[in-house]
Interface confidence: low
């Protein structure tokens, strides 16, 4: 790994052992300045593997609202607008980090948590068995 | 929003103002117990809008490694295995939270940061402008 010299101006860390508790500033810095927010807003409808977005809310989590994609069909939409079952709509999943209040209901104490979310769907060729 | 009674066993918070600094336990809890890791492993190759995965590494960020999807084609793969430019491969993007070391190089002090990542690609019908 890359070793970086420690900044002498860092806050003191009480506990040097894992599980490590760190200080986190929740004033979010958004680096997405150059992105067009509308860009992917309608892909869920225009895709050949369209999906619905479901709201998942949990006040004990930060962020408290996460949107989950669910593929509308098992097959994919063909050129005629019909569902073709020779192809499959599948969710594209990603592991993301969230903060979970710990102990519960505490406003200033969290634990890092990894969760799997479905972001959208893509159309794939079915798992085809190739016989030698 | 939902108001939850504060747990009396919470650690004390020095600063009640935003930007708020909180304590975060970095011992990650993984809630993805029921997922089958093989499921989406080959979608990037089997998709009609295939993508490549690029490694994005930043030692000042947690997690330090993030994988970015880049669509292989402008069009989508048709039944004959050729690229059809009547359809478009587009990236499905998601905003995720990461921790940015602040001040730089500090092992135990972070700021929450929102970044936009491309998770995979989907095939969409192009937006056609009808001229009156």
């Amino acid at each position: 790994g890359i070793t970086i010299p420690r900044n002498p101006g860092c806050p003191n860390s009480e506990d040097k052992n894992f599980p490590r508790t760190v200080m986190v500033n929740l004033n979010i810095h958004n680096r997405n300045t150059n992105t067009n927010p509308k860009r992917s807003s309608d892909y869920y409808n225009r895709s050949t593997s369209p999906w619905n977005l479901h709201r998942n809310e949990d006040p004990e989590r930060y962020p408290s609202v996460i949107w989950e994609a669910k593929c509308r069909h098992l097959g994919c939409i063909n050129a005629d607008g019909n569902v073709d079952y020779h192809m499959n709509s599948v969710p594209i999943q990603q592991e993301i980090l969230v903060l979970r209040r710990e102990p519960p209901h505490c406003p200033n104490s969290f634990r890092l948590e990894k969760i799997l979310v479905s972001v959208g769907c893509t159309c794939v060729t079915p798992i085809v068995h190739h016989v030698a | 929003g939902i108001t939850i009674p504060r747990n009396p066993g919470c650690p004390n918070s020095e600063d009640k103002n935003f930007p708020r600094t909180v304590m975060v336990n970095l011992n990650i809890h993984n809630r993805n117990t029921n997922t089958n890791p093989k499921r989406s492993s080959d979608y990037y190759n089997r998709s009609t809008s295939p993508w490549n995965l690029h490694r994005n590494e930043d030692p000042e960020r947690y997690p330090s490694v993030i994988w970015e999807a880049k669509c292989r084609h402008l069009g989508c793969i048709n039944a004959d295995g050729n690229v059809d430019y009547h359809m478009n491969s587009v990236p499905i993007q998601q905003e995720i939270l990461v921790l940015r070391r602040e001040p730089p190089h500090c092992p135990n002090s972070f700021r929450l940061e929102k970044i936009l990542v491309s998770v995979g690609c989907t095939c969409v019908t192009p937006i056609v402008h009808h001229v009156a």
């Epitope: 669910k70 509308r72 098992l74 020779h86 079915p126 798992i127 085809v128 068995h129 | -």
Partner: antibody, heavy 119, light 110 residues
Framework: EVQLLESGGGLVQPGGSLRLSCAAS????????MIWVRQAPGKGLEWVSY????????VYADSVKGRFTISRDNSKNTLYLQMNSLRAEDTAVYYC????????????WGQGTTVTVSS | QSALTQPASVSGSPGQSITISCTGS?????????VSWYQQHPAKAPKLLIY???HRPSGVSNRFSGSKSGNTASLTISGLQGEDEADYYC??????????FGGGTKLTVL
């Protein structure tokens, strides 16, 4: 507890109609594809019909095409099967089952409701 | 939408292993890795045992395993137990419809 509960079965004359219901509980119904499967007395399983999670897509087995209609009401967590022009060969136990969007397996089944078509 | 072919019955003694075959064609079992297996006890609903040829849902005993060769899928039950006595059905995705089932196999534990 994840559960599917069918109802609406009974005795009907050939050419008659029946509407089956399947009440879902213990999971987010609108996230799942649903199907109906039937089993004639002493026979094997036969896939009947499929509906997408949002209700927008439906598919039918050749044996019921044009006679049966599958539908769902996600606000009521309920799946339906409207059966018209019933025939003696439609006599069976009808099961509803849940299909995740990852694969073509049916991971949760109801207990079944019996439909008898006889004069 | 003709059914996949399964043996009508198989039997085995407790502790033994048995295998149930499910033969299709190059349009279903041979083409796709979307083969599922279900167990059904008398007067009960079917239960998913295997999906995508080899994958077991959580809660299903590891005594149940699936495999495939060419146009034939197989379900193997090792360490046979009395409670395994039931009917077993295979199912596959096909090139003409989302699902087709096998005719079913009655397993008798001697």
């Amino acid at each position: 507890e994840v559960q599917l509960l069918e109802s609406g079965g009974g005795l009907v004359q050939p050419g008659g109609s029946l509407r089956l219901s399947c009440a879902a509980s213990g999971f987010t119904f609108s996230h799942y594809h649903m199907i109906w499967v039937r089993q004639a007395p002493g026979k094997g399983l036969e896939w009947v019909s499929y509906i997408g999670s949002s209700g927008g897509q439906t598919v039918y087995a050749d044996s019921v095409k044009g006679r049966f209609t599958i539908s769902r009401d996600n606000s009521k967590n309920t799946l339906y099967l409207q059966m018209n022009s019933l025939r003696a060969e439609d006599t069976a136990v009808y099961y509803c089952a849940r299909v995740p969007d990852y694969y073509y397996g049916m991971d949760v089944w109801g207990q079944g409701t019996t439909v008898t078509v006889s004069s | 939408q003709s059914a996949l072919t399964q043996p009508a019955s198989v039997s085995g003694s407790p502790g033994q292993s048995i295998t149930i075959s499910c033969t299709g064609s190059s349009d279903d079992v041979g083409r796709y890795d979307y083969v599922s297996w279900y167990q059904q006890h008398p007067a009960k609903a079917p239960k998913l045992l295997i999906y995508e040829v080899t994958h077991r849902p959580s809660g299903v005993s590891n005594r149940f395993s699936g495999s495939k060769s060419g146009n034939t899928a197989s379900l193997t039950i090792s360490g046979l137990q009395g409670e395994d006595e039931a009917d077993y059905y295979c199912s596959s995705h096909t090139s003409t419809s989302p699902w087709v089932f096998g005719g079913g196999t009655k397993l008798t534990v001697l």
